[in-house]
Interface confidence: low
Amino acid sequence: KVFGRCELAAAMKRHGLDNYRGYSLGNWVCAAKFESNFNTQATNRNTDGSTDYGILQINSRWWCNDGRTPGSRNLCNIPCSALLSSDITASVNCAKKIVSDGNGMNAWVAWRNRCKGTDVQAWIRGCRL
């Protein structure tokens, strides 16, 4: 599923991401834009043999099990395929664990490079939330 900007903002708010660990909703929508272009089925291969999955591009070396990543920790205790669902519950729950891990949203390279320090509220402007 490819979400619309406001559609995703509403879904993320419903799942409790607004101001989760101090990160406003705009941060999460911005991260999703630059990680996956709002596509729940996005997958991207990394040079270390791991793969990033879903709307927030969650990594198989640490957070989910895809059965093919050497030394995978599966800290969210889910199959990576769950992160590709049009229902973003699994991605949100895992993202909450990631953002609580010490580095905050710096765990998402796209957020660090494209969203951090920018006007992230622009990503929810005009949305009925």
Epitope: T43, G49, D66, T69, P79, S81
Partner: antibody, heavy 116, light 107 residues
Framework: QVQLQESGAEVMKPGASVKISCKAT????????IEWVKQRPGHGLEWIGE????????YYNEKFKGKATFTADTSSNTAYMQLSSLTSEDSAVYYC?????????WGQGTTLTVSS | DIELTQSPATLSVTPGDSVSLSCRAS??????LHWYQQKSHESPRLLIK???QRASGIPSRFSGSGSGTDFTLSINSVETEDFGMYFC?????????FGGGTKLEIK
């Protein structure tokens, strides 16, 4: 237990297309990549590519782009590989395997013969 | 693409002998190297994963070692059921590649 059951041997004419199936049982089909491997006598084993059934995401060996197309039907836990514009070079045994980086589980192989 | 070179191409041994098969990678692949056995008209069977971990159900006479570019599969006291082809495969990068194989035959 994990099993991969491939479709039977095929004899095809040059220029035709063929679709090989691989039915998976004994595990969560959507969670693991299905790999496809070609074996020709004297040519060893060649990795064709892979599909993640849960998303339909595919990765192809550059050498097989345009030759092989992967699909998966999650309702029947079956992966498919279509080979197009067949030539004698495509005559081989084709295996599906469950992708774990290494391949612990393999299908029994499908023998494809391309002959006029 | 990473090339895997196996040697020797053929190894003739007597049951009871101990043997070593080599697999060399064209660039470093850490420990992401796996070994398979294949008998005539059968599918490959995983023996060793990640260079040194025996797969489930594999007898202890099979062992693997190596890291980086040089890897070895050792069979301690070969049994008659061990004869066949042996392939290495890397999972360090895409495309996945296999070695050309070593044929283990009875002398």
């Amino acid at each position: 237990q994990v099993q991969l059951q491939e479709s039977g041997a095929e004899v095809m004419k040059p220029g035709a297309s063929v679709k090989i199936s691989c039915k998976a049982t004994g595990y969560t089909f959507t969670t693991y990549w299905i790999e496809w491997v070609k074996q020709r006598p004297g040519h060893g084993l060649e990795w064709i590519g892979e599909i993640l059934p849960g998303s339909g995401s595919t990765y192809y060996n550059e050498k097989f782009k345009g030759k092989a197309t992967f699909t998966a039907d999650t309702s029947s836990n079956t992966a498919y590989m279509q080979l197009s514009s067949l030539t004698s070079e495509d005559s081989a045994v084709y295996y599906c395997a469950r992708g774990d980086g290494h391949y612990c589980y393999w299908g029994q192989g499908t023998t494809l013969t391309v002959s006029s | 693409d990473i090339e895997l070179t196996q040697s020797p191409a053929t190894l003739s041994v007597t049951p009871g002998d101990s043997v070593s098969l080599s697999c060399r990678a064209s660039q470093s692949i850490s420990n992401n190297l796996h070994w398979y056995q294949q008998k005539s008209h059968e599918s490959p069977r995983l023996l060793i994963k990640y260079a040194s971990q025996r797969a489930s159900g594999i007898p202890s006479r099979f062992s693997g070692s190596g890291s980086g570019t040089d890897f070895t599969l050792s069979i301690n006291s070969v049994e008659t059921e061990d004869f066949g082809m042996y392939f290495c495969q890397q999972s360090n990068s895409w495309p996945r590649t296999f070695g050309g194989g070593t044929k283990l035959e009875i002398k």
